[in-house]
Structures are given as structure tokens and as C-alpha cells.
Amino acid sequence: KETAFVEVVLFESSPSGDYTTYTTGLTGRFSRAGATLSAEGEIVQMHPLGLCNNNDEEDLYEYGWVGVVKLEQPELDPKPCLTVLGKAKRAVQRGATAVIFDVSENPEAIDQLNQGSEDPLKRPVVYVKGADAIKLMNIVNKQKVARARIQHRPPRQPTEYFDM
């Protein structure tokens, strides 16, 4: 289970209409459910139940986003529509280039994601918890554009690859 280095860049629009960027670094873990690959895209927050809709229709929104899912306590969802792995698969089917799970309230999900899968996803599935998860969710919950860049080695220059 390798460390995933995640850079999150928040884009704040300035009075002139340009963007000011703020970069936050945090760490998670690549799970065995997905590939240990770098990935980058706009963050899209997904509610766990939002991944339950099983219609196979693609919508008109763009591909290449990074899905962020805050998992709830198991007691709040005793009969989930999909396993955690199933939710990751559903997000990738809908165009996610990577999925990040906040497992702070559902640490059991770590074992589920790390059970050896015969058919692991070809995109990274990362989990974060604790202070890193709090930092991530604080950014995700803002009504602002944010991009995530996931790497499997520490970043050299934080903002080098980001442009809008």
C-alpha cells in the first residue's frame, strides 16, 4: 500500500476575473482496488448514495475528474446499494480518472478496498483519513473550483502542472 501524494489546488476568482490559486498538500494511500498511477482532474464531490443510481447512461458532463467520496458510518447505511469497490467502479464508469475516499468514519472500508481483486480498476483508488481527510473535505465543501493531482512520489514543484 504505497503512499499517495495529493496536491489540491483551489481556484479563487479575483475582482479582475483572473484566478488566484492556493495549493494544499496531503497524503493518502493507494488501495489495491485500483492502479498505482498518477492522475489529475477537477474535484467532483460525490455523495455515496449518488453512486447508487444504476442507470448506465452517461451524462453530458466532462470526463477526467477526480471523485471525492466521504463514506458514512456503516450504521447509517446498513444495507449499502454497492460495496465501496462497487462505488469506485461506478465513479470510474462515469468518467472519473481517480477516486479518493474519506474513510475517517468508516475505517472498515480500508480492508474492503485492499482485498485483492481479480479485476482491479485501471485508475487509482486512494483513501485518506484523519487530518488529511479534514483538509481535503474543507476544500471540497467550498463552492469553488478545485483540482487534485495524485502522485506516487513526492511532488517537486507544487503548482508546476496546474493551469485552467
Epitope: Q45, H47, G50, E58, D59, L60, E62, Y63, G64
Partner: antibody, heavy 117, light 113 residues
Framework: EVQLLESGGGLVQPGGSLRLSCAAS????????MSWVRQAPGKGLEWVSG????????YYADSVKGRFTISRDNSKNTLYLQMNSLRAEDRAVYYC??????????WGQGTLVTVSS | DIVMTQSPDSLAVSLGERATINCTSS????????????LAWYQQKPGQPPKLLIY???TRASGVPDRFSGSGSGTDFTLTISSLQAEDVAVYYC?????????FGQGTKVEIK
């Protein structure tokens, strides 16, 4: 630089057909849903049709369902709108637009379709 | 289909004054997954294609000056131009892109008084 260039507009008789094209450049075309939006002279905007990034799913306004067909060729970075059984009320400037979670962020300059006998 | 209704149809405002446009949707455009309102505002000047101004009901698009602001949630939304400039004369449209078919409001023409 993102560019969308529509073509294929022109004069057609009622009941006739026309095929519009939209050539896209400056972005990864097969990562984005695309739409056609039209505007009749002096009127407002009307969303006509949309297609998902892969082309697997298509969507239509009720006013064109069964008459218009949206398609795309991701190898050619091109979006199409096949318009059959054209009516006088289809007369409009037709725009293609790139779809995102931020709405339609880039638009072409439009191509005029005139339906008249 | 979601019906979008704008008011007023036209608006005449003095230079430097505030212009306010309202938009109501027939059902909520709040996206259940990410809690964002899939509501955009566009500006269209004569002979030009529309230009994206605001998305997620309140976030300014790149290059849009801060005199333009959006607010609202669920079914009721507002576009405000805090200090009207000559270059803001245009027709403004709201659009829901929450569910297909996407739909626009009928437009509001903003002129200088």
C-alpha cells in the same frame, strides 16, 4: 485555444434535410459532452440536443425528437446534427457548445439554417 | 422538463447603478451528489454567441469581472450587476443544466437608461 467552428447551414425547403458539422480543436474532444443550441431570429436560446463524451448517449428537446439526430466522430474531433423533415420554425442560428459541470463554457460562432419554399 | 422563467423581460438602468435579474426554475436544480446548483448565467451581445458568466449559481467564470454576481439555491436565483457599465448592455439568460433536456430562461434585455 479552444475553438468550435460550425458549418453546413444554408437554405432548405420545408420537409428537406441538412447536416450541420462542428469542428473542435484546442481540447481533448472525447472527454467532453457536446450540445447544439439554436436561436431563431430575434428570439431566445433553445437547447436542441446533446451527446455524451463517448457518443453512447444522446438527448433531445421534444421539439426535434424523431427528426434530428446528433452524433460525433471522436477520431475527427467533429460533432454533427442531422436535421430531417425541416419546418419553418427550425429556422435559426445553430451553435455548438462544449458541456461541463460549469455549464456550456465554449461556443462556436453559429451557422444559419433557413427553411423556406 | 424543467421550465425556467426570467423576470423582468427588459431592464433599463443608469450607468453605475445596480441591475438585478431573477430566474425561477419549476423544480430544484440542486445536484444531489455534490450539493451544487447546476444553474448558469450567460451574456449575449448582438451578433455574438453567448458567453458563460456564472456557474453553480454563484461562481464567476474565468475573466468575468466581480461586478457580476449570482446568488440563490434550489429554484430561485438572481444575477446582479453591481455597477452597470456601457459594455454590459446585452441579453442575459439563465440555464439549468441539472437534467436533460437542458432549458433556458426567455432572456432579459439590459439597456442603459
Amino acid at each position: 485555444e479552444v475553438q468550435l467552428l460550425e458549418s453546413g447551414g444554408g437554405l432548405v425547403q420545408p420537409g428537406g434535410s441538412l447536416r450541420l458539422s462542428c469542428a473542435a480543436s484546442g481540447f481533448t474532444f472525447n472527454n467532453f459532452g457536446m450540445s447544439w443550441v439554436r436561436q431563431a431570429p430575434g428570439k431566445g436560446l433553445e437547447w436542441v440536443s446533446g451527446i455524451s463524451a463517448s457518443g453512447r448517449n444522446t438527448y433531445y428537446a421534444d421539439s426535434v425528437k424523431g427528426r434530428f439526430t446528433i452524433s460525433r466522430d471522436n477520431s475527427k474531433n467533429t460533432l454533427y446534427l442531422q436535421m430531417n423533415s425541416l419546418r419553418a420554425e427550425d429556422r435559426a442560428v445553430y451553435y455548438c457548445a462544449r458541456e461541463t459541470r460549469h455549464g456550456s463554457d465554449y461556443w462556436g460562432q453559429g451557422t444559419l439554417v433557413t427553411v423556406s419554399s | 422538463d424543467i421550465v425556467m422563467t426570467q423576470s423582468p423581460d427588459s431592464l433599463a438602468v443608469s450607468l453605475g447603478e445596480r441591475a438585478t435579474i431573477n430566474c425561477t426554475s419549476s423544480q430544484s436544480v440542486l445536484h444531489s451528489s455534490n450539493k451544487k446548483n447546476y444553474l448558469a448565467w450567460y451574456q449575449q451581445k448582438p451578433g455574438q454567441p453567448p458567453k458563460l458568466l456564472i456557474y453553480w449559481a454563484s461562481t464567476r467564470a474565468s475573466g468575468v469581472p466581480d461586478r457580476f454576481s449570482g446568488s440563490g439555491s434550489g429554484t430561485d436565483f438572481t444575477l446582479t450587476i453591481s455597477s452597470l457599465q456601457a459594455e454590459d448592455v446585452a441579453v442575459y439568460y439563465c440555464q439549468q443544466y441539472h437534467s436533460t433536456p437542458y432549458t433556458f430562461g426567455q432572456g432579459t434585455k439590459v439597456e442603459i437608461k
